[in-house]
């Protein structure tokens, strides 16, 4: 039951990546607006994009705060220009989304190479640490931060001219690899959490090839 | 649900050509790279190679002059061809899928013996 | 290429008793390293990856440890079902397998 002519949100769902996270939902609205409230199992409601027409509501700063909680959020229906008005029952509709653990749940971002660089035989790629949104004592935390060991990336590397391909793994953000000497190399990086089931994989990165401004080439 | 199976001839003559099939179900080649493991008898696993999702490859050096891995992505199956078999090739061979940080599933596995 | 080094190559354990694996590489493989269970059958699963996390399904006595170079695998309750041989594997190019340990009941 509700006021006549607005309707309850429903398809809540969560979109996060590197912990960046909006709750959306549907429908557009006709003649009613939302406000969003947010929680942790044992906390109080937060409210968020009061009164708003918009069918998302950016919720990074609330989660950041612990990304490890477990957050529940709602979405309330109102009359548009009357927004005090409620249900039958003496309150606005409101649906529940599912609940949100940010860390264990958050996308990973496509990683990027931030450089290489070639010694003789071995080449040192270095894979970019990208920036969160998570704080710690007024800073903002990067990926690694965050994750710790529980983050590796996969690095894939292979011959420009050959239809072999290789691999290499860490737990930090840098690879050592052994290569040819006089071949160009192509790298893609991928980034991974072990210990998840779900949303355990990053896209891979762009691919960067030997050759290209990106990488150094040393004669030792 | 995910499987995996292999199948080919249980038996090669020397210096003949194997070739082993892998059939794979509930996941696309696509998305997961398939590896083959080989386990001669009485010897641990050995890794022979693995097809990568974009469909390129890597091959255990010792093997690489007579391995080839392909597949064939709308069949979801991945193909092993390996020449000049010996004695010492009789093991039991098996297709795994690759999650990354381990080989999650495993096919049952195809015993072949080399033998005139 | 990073080699593998296990042992014991075989033990024999009573029901009940913990039973420790031990698996070394020959470099720093960044905890980048899983445990296989093979049985007679010719079956083979996925026991642990990178180092510590259970794959799904393994009852909970199967646990992982280490870092660097050194790695073990312990299963804290030895089971009659645990009757097999045990691998650790390395996960770079190319990978590589230690040489088993075949635990048998005492």
């Known amino acids: 039951s509700g006021t006549t002519n607005t309707v309850a949100a429903y398809n809540l769902t969560w979109k996060s990546t590197n912990f960046k996270t909006i709750l959306e939902w549907e429908p557009k609205p006709v003649n009613q607006v939302y406000t969003v409230q947010i929680s942790t199992k044992s906390g109080d409601w937060k409210s968020k994009c009061f009164y708003t027409t918009d069918t998302e509501c950016d919720l990074t700063d609330e989660i950041v705060k612990d990304v490890k909680q477990t957050y529940l959020a709602r979405v309330f229906s109102y009359p548009a220009g009357n927004v005090e008005s409620t249900g039958s029952a003496g309150e606005p509709l409101y649906e529940n989304s599912p609940e949100f653990t940010p860390y264990l749940e958050t996308n990973l971002g496509q990683p990027t190479i931030q450089s290489f660089e070639q010694v003789g035989t071995k080449v040192n790629v270095t894979v970019e640490d990208e920036r969160t949104l998570v704080r710690r004592n007024n800073t903002f935390l990067s990926l690694r931060d965050v994750f710790g060991k529980d983050l590796i990336y996969t690095l894939y590397y292979w011959k420009s001219s050959s239809s072999g391909k290789k691999t290499a793994k860490t737990n930090t953000n840098e690879f050592l690899i052994d290569v040819d000497k006089g071949e160009n190399y192509c790298f893609s990086v991928q980034a991974v959490i072990p210990s998840r089931t779900v949303n355990r994989k990053s896209t891979d990165s762009p691919v960067e090839c030997m050759g290209q401004e990106k990488g150094e080439f040393r004669e030792i | 649900q995910v499987q995996l199976k292999e199948s080919g001839p249980g038996l090669v003559q020397p210096s003949q050509t194997l070739s082993l099939t892998c059939i794979v179900s509930?996941?696309?080649?696509?998305?997961?790279?398939v590896h083959w493991v080989r386990q001669p008898a009485g010897a641990g696993l050995e890794w022979m190679g693995v097809?990568?999702?974009?469909?390129?490859?890597d091959y255990n050096s010792t093997l690489q002059s007579r391995l080839s891995i392909s597949r064939d992505t709308s069949k979801s199956q991945v193909f092993l061809k390996m020449n000049s078999l010996q004695a010492e090739d009789i093991a039991t061979y098996y297709c795994?899928?690759?999650?990354?940080?381990?080989?999650?599933?495993w096919g049952q596995g195809v015993m072949v013996t080399v033998s005139s | 290429d990073i080699k593998m080094t296990q042992s014991p190559s075989s033990l024999s354990a009573s029901l009940g008793e913990r039973v420790t694996i031990s698996c070394r590489a020959s470099?720093?493989?960044?905890?980048?390293l899983a445990w296989y269970q093979k049985k007679e059958d010719g079956s083979v699963k996925l026991l642990i990856h990178?180092?510590?996390n259970l794959q799904s399904g393994v009852p909970s006595r199967f646990s992982g440890s280490g870092s660097g170079k050194d790695y073990s695998l312990t299963i804290s309750g030895l089971e009659s079902e645990d009757i097999a041989t045990y691998y650790c594997?390395?996960?770079?190019?190319?990978?590589?397998f230690g040489a088993g340990t075949k635990l048998e009941l005492k």
């Open positions: 795994a899928r690759d999650w990354d940080t381990g080989f999650d599933y």
């Open positions: 509930g996941f696309s080649l696509t998305n997961y790279n």
């Open positions: 097809i990568w999702t974009d469909g390129k490859t």
């Open positions: 470099e720093n493989i960044n905890n980048i």
């Open positions: 990178y180092t510590s």
């Open positions: 594997q390395q996960a770079y190019t190319p990978y590589a």
